[in-house]
């Protein structure tokens, strides 16, 4: 740092004064010197370092008419909005010839009410769940003692006796306000008031109660909600065949979820209009007057298989002597599961019914009993899944096949009543 030399008498006739004030204060430091000849530029030092970007003004007044006469030079340093970084020892510095002169020091101090570096923030917390709040204040003057208040009631018997920078709250059962007071020798400052909103806890134990092909009944255990009763719970279901995002823990499903609201209690809901034999992910959140809980994790569930909703289509049945050829197409109606195969039943007028499991083929050749003289032979076909048989087609009569003719196609549908099966010699 530049140092003054004592070889010549200092040109300074006025030195900087002292400023002590609170944050935000505006003040001016002033020094004055009298020199002979060309007036020098006045520099300002803070704690021995030249202030390169000082907000200073310099005024020069000649005391005579000749340039070589004496000049009065006044430099003023303006400090706007006093901050901690402005504090320190201030001096003026001039270079005169080969010599450096430094004024006597003036001091800038900061002293006022405590200043908050950190204040408690608004937040939501689940009922009866621990959380922390932060508050930090500084002087000068130090020390600064904190006193936390909850709903305007002090949480300690005196400032500096309770938690200081961090307040640990073991849990709340009602929405509350928190603030902190900062005390120092100059007075008290109160922080902003943070509102801590108590929401219901996340529901627990989301599980399936019963499953049907197009509906699921689910139940859950509600979390605590403090003094605020739950008003309703919301259940979301999303198809999970493209739900890799859910598996990877993404917060939102890849498509618009199906949303249902449940009045509570009971904490149970029947989700309808679902696809059979389809994987879903479901989650639930519950709401009180204060707002909703967080969602549960996505729970993978699956609707069970159902039976096919319609019979096979386009059944044709032709007879050629003791052989009959039957073929059909997959039902147009929803299968409600994985098609495992077809059952076929045929029966003559006075003969017992014969039942066959055809598997997944869509045609079959039947070897008829005897010489094929059985009259009024009819055939029915049903598709089946793991859940059971779908409706049977209406009986299709076996028609004699004439070469060159197209085989007849029957689209009649039989009521979905199960035939009275018998197990003949077949």
């Amino acid at each position: 740092a530049p140092r003054g030399t004592q070889a010549e008498e200092s040109p300074f006739v006025g030195n900087p004064g002292n400023i002590t004030g609170a944050r935000g204060l505006t003040g001016t430091l002033r020094c004055q010197l009298q020199v002979q000849g060309e007036p020098p530029e006045v520099h300002w030092l803070r704690d021995g370092q030249i202030l390169e970007l000082a907000d200073s003004t310099q005024t020069q007044v000649p005391l005579g008419e000749d340039e070589q006469d004496d000049w009065i030079v006044v430099s003023q340093l303006r400090i706007t909005s006093l901050q901690l970084s402005d504090t320190g020892q201030y001096q003026c510095l001039v270079f005169l010839g080969h010599q450096t002169f430094v004024s006597q020091p003036g001091y800038v101090g900061l002293e006022g009410l405590p200043y908050f570096l950190e204040e408690p923030e608004d937040r939501t917390v689940a009922a009866n769940t621990p959380f922390n709040l932060s508050c930090q204040a500084q002087g000068p003057p130090e020390p600064v003692d904190l006193l936390w208040l909850q709903d305007a009631v002090p949480l300690a018997t005196a400032p500096g006796h309770g938690p200081q920078r961090s307040l640990h709250v073991p849990g709340l059962n009602k929405t509350s306000s928190f603030s902190c007071e900062a005390h120092n020798a100059k007075g008290v400052t109160t922080s902003r008031t943070a509102t801590i909103t108590v929401l219901p806890q996340q529901p627990r134990n989301l599980h399936l109660v019963s499953r049907q092909p197009t509906e699921l009944e689910v139940a859950w255990t509600p979390g605590l909600s403090g003094i605020y009763p739950l008003t309703h719970c919301t259940l979301q279901a999303v198809l999970s065949d493209d739900g890799m995002g859910i598996q990877a823990g993404e917060p939102d499903p890849p498509e618009e979820p199906l949303t249902s609201q449940a009045s509570v209690p009971p904490h149970q809901l029947r989700l309808g209009s679902l696809h059979p034999h389809t994987p879903y992910h479901i989650r639930v959140a519950c709401t009180s007057s204060q707002g909703p809980s967080s969602w549960t994790h996505w729970l993978p569930v699956e609707t069970p298989e159902g039976v096919p909703l319609g019979p096979p289509e386009n059944i044709s049945a032709t007879r050629n002597g003791s052989q009959a050829f039957v073929h059909w197409q997959e039902p147009r109606a929803p299968l409600q599961g994985t098609l495992l195969g077809y059952r076929l039943a045929y029966q003559g007028q006075d003969t017992p019914e014969v039942l066959m499991d055809i598997g997944l083929r869509q045609e079959v050749t039947l070897e008829l009993q005897g010489d094929g003289s059985v009259s009024n032979l009819t055939v029915c076909v049903a598709a089946y899944t793991a859940a059971g048989d779908g409706p049977w087609s209406l009986p299709v009569p076996l028609e004699a096949w004439r070469p060159g003719e197209a085989q007849p196609v029957h689209q009649l549908v039989k009521e979905p009543s199960t035939p009275a099966f018998s197990w003949p010699w077949w």
């Epitope: 020390p143 300690a156 018997t157 400032p159 006796h161 309770g162 200081q164 007075g187 008290v188």
Partner: antibody, heavy 113, light 107 residues
Framework: QVQLQESGPGLVKPSETLSLTCTVS????????WGWIRQPPGKGLEWIGY???????SYNPSLKSRVTISRDTSKNQFSLKLSSVTAADTAVYYC???????WGQGTLVTVSS | DIQMTQSPSSLSASVGDRVTITCRAS??????LRWFQQKPGKAPKLLIS???NLAAGVPSRFSGSGSGSDYTLTISSLQPEDFATYYC?????????FGQGTKVEIK
Amino acid sequence: QVQLQESGPGLVKPSETLSLTCTVSGYSITSNYWGWIRQPPGKGLEWIGYITYSGSTSYNPSLKSRVTISRDTSKNQFSLKLSSVTAADTAVYYCAITTFYYWGQGTLVTVSS
Amino acid sequence: DIQMTQSPSSLSASVGDRVTITCRASQDIGNYLRWFQQKPGKAPKLLISGATNLAAGVPSRFSGSGSGSDYTLTISSLQPEDFATYYCLQSKESPWTFGQGTKVEIK
């Protein structure tokens, strides 16, 4: 720097009221809490009570019926009054900020006729 | 009222010794505990606040520990100027209560 100074009579007659004043310099009594503690000769410390920056008070229940702490913010002073004193109230009386960073030097009050 | 029981009531030790003073509260005081040193004819001096926090200007040979209802003041290496009486204070509840004191004397 912060200084606290107790003042008041060193001798009080039994059944009379003990009155002490604590003058604070370097710290505004409109901040923090300010208390009185006493120590009978050769014995331990006993908390008497405090006055808060806003003027509310808290007293030791064992003395509550006899004690009053008040303040004069214009003089930056707070005071202790203890009524109906007996020889058992003979003690060194200290004033202090309740964080206990700063104490008065203490004043001995003897209760004797 | 919360009772504060300090032990021992007195102890004799030599310079350089490690000294431990304990304070037991009649209930959980959640670290609302201060330790003081008092020399004859002087006001007490704050050593520790919040059970563990060293007050400004107090030598690091002093330390506080504990939680719940049991607290300890430790002087790691006793110095000549440490011979004094030590008090604990609970400020969890009103009335604030002091321990009865521990006098540390020269052996």
